[in-house]
Interface confidence: low
């Protein structure tokens, strides 16, 4: 397993609709044709997998099983969007990139993007 540098923004604020987007960029040492991207969430020293996608270079990412993530790729950049976030989902979201094919296998893990989610204030009931 060879190491690879992965860059991602330090902080992102989710929208009022609970959507957060950020770019995950990796320094590809070779000509990878198959890439796997995994988003991990670290909170309270616990790491959980949020979503994962495998894609062919130049093609779109396919997230599986009702994923809360969507994404597009462009060269060595992956544009990730995480939906349905609530205040309790605030945490450090780490981008992990694996160059699956062809060999050799490379692995890169970013420093993480701190995503802040603020639940919108509920609208007061209207009297008609």
């Amino acid at each position: 397993c060879k190491a690879m540098h992965v860059a991602q923004p330090a902080v992102v604020l989710a929208s009022s609709r609970g959507i957060a987007s950020f770019v995950c960029e990796y320094a590809s040492p070779g000509k990878a044709t198959e890439v796997r991207v995994t988003v991990l969430r670290q909170a309270d020293s616990q790491v959980t997998e949020v979503c994962a996608a495998t894609y062919m270079m130049g093609n779109e990412l396919t997230f599986l099983d009702d994923s809360i993530c969507t994404g597009t790729s462009s060269g060595n950049q992956v544009n990730l969007t995480i939906q349905g976030l609530r205040a309790m989902d605030t945490g450090l979201y780490i981008c992990k990139v694996e160059l699956m094919y062809p060999p050799p296998y490379y692995l890169g893990i970013g420093n993480g993007t701190q995503i802040y989610v603020i639940d919108p204030e509920p609208c007061p009931d209207s009297d008609f």
Epitope: R36, A52, M56, G58, N59, E60, T62, L64, D65, D66
Partner: antibody, heavy 120, light 106 residues
């Protein structure tokens, strides 16, 4: 009504290639990926790969890279799979099946399968 | 790749009997999905996202589980339930199917 139409059977010689089709109807062809699954006689199911008819991007099971090529013809709402360098191990029923999305279950629709027999 | 092992490989049950079959994954998966297949026919989606019954599936079927251990249960076996059942994961590529459990009528 969603339908995936596959055609019967193919008898091919070892080393040859075969191209099978899967004609979709009853939905917008470009809205859903199409997957292909293999089932050897009396065995389990193996996922070969899938294709996005809109972008024509593909994902393959590593096992079938170099063996299978997935393509589509959007004008006729038809997905194709070509298998090359066939051996007796490739004798199987090949199914096309439709992906889902957040609202529709995956693999809810299947073709009736194409039986490929590799024999000299 | 994630390997799915189903047990038992073959089982038989009498009408009215409760049936449980299991699917064990080599690593954790988000959901498990189940397909029913009868000889000479295409597989049918039977249970998806672990516990949701596909359209037309009788309520005597149920699915449960999490992580690496999942199961399909029939509360009361009926003759039409005799078939082979396959589990499937879509958590990571390549998508994989289980080895299958053949359910026979006793």
């Amino acid at each position: 009504e969603v339908q995936l139409q596959q055609f019967g059977a193919e008898l091919v010689k070892p080393g040859a290639s075969v191209k099978m089709s899967c004609k979709a109807s009853g939905y917008t062809f470009t809205d859903y990926n199409m997957d292909w699954v293999r089932q050897s006689h009396g065995k389990s199911l193996e996922w070969i790969g899938n294709i996005n008819p809109n972008s024509e991007s593909t994902s393959y099971n590593q096992k079938f890279k170099g063996k299978a090529t997935l393509t589509v013809d959007k004008s006729s709402s038809t997905a194709y799979m070509e298998l090359r360098s066939l051996t007796s191990d490739d004798t199987a029923v090949y199914y096309c099946t439709r992906d889902g999305n957040r609202y529709d279950a995956w693999f809810a629709y299947w073709g009736q399968g194409t039986l490929v027999t590799v024999s000299s | 790749q994630i390997v799915l092992t189903q047990s038992p490989a073959i089982m038989s049950a009498s009408p009215g009997e409760k049936v449980t079959m299991t699917c064990s994954a080599s690593s954790s998966v988000t959901y498990m999905h189940w397909f029913q297949q009868k000889p000479g026919t295409s597989p049918k989606l039977w249970i998806y996202s672990t516990s949701i019954l596909a359209s037309g599936v009788p309520a005597r079927f149920s699915g449960s589980g999490s992580g690496t251990s999942y199961s399909l249960t029939i509360s009361r076996m009926e003759a039409e339930d005799a078939a082979t059942y396959y589990c499937q994961q879509r958590t990571s590529y390549p998508l994989t199917f289980g080895t299958g459990t053949k359910l026979e009528l006793k």
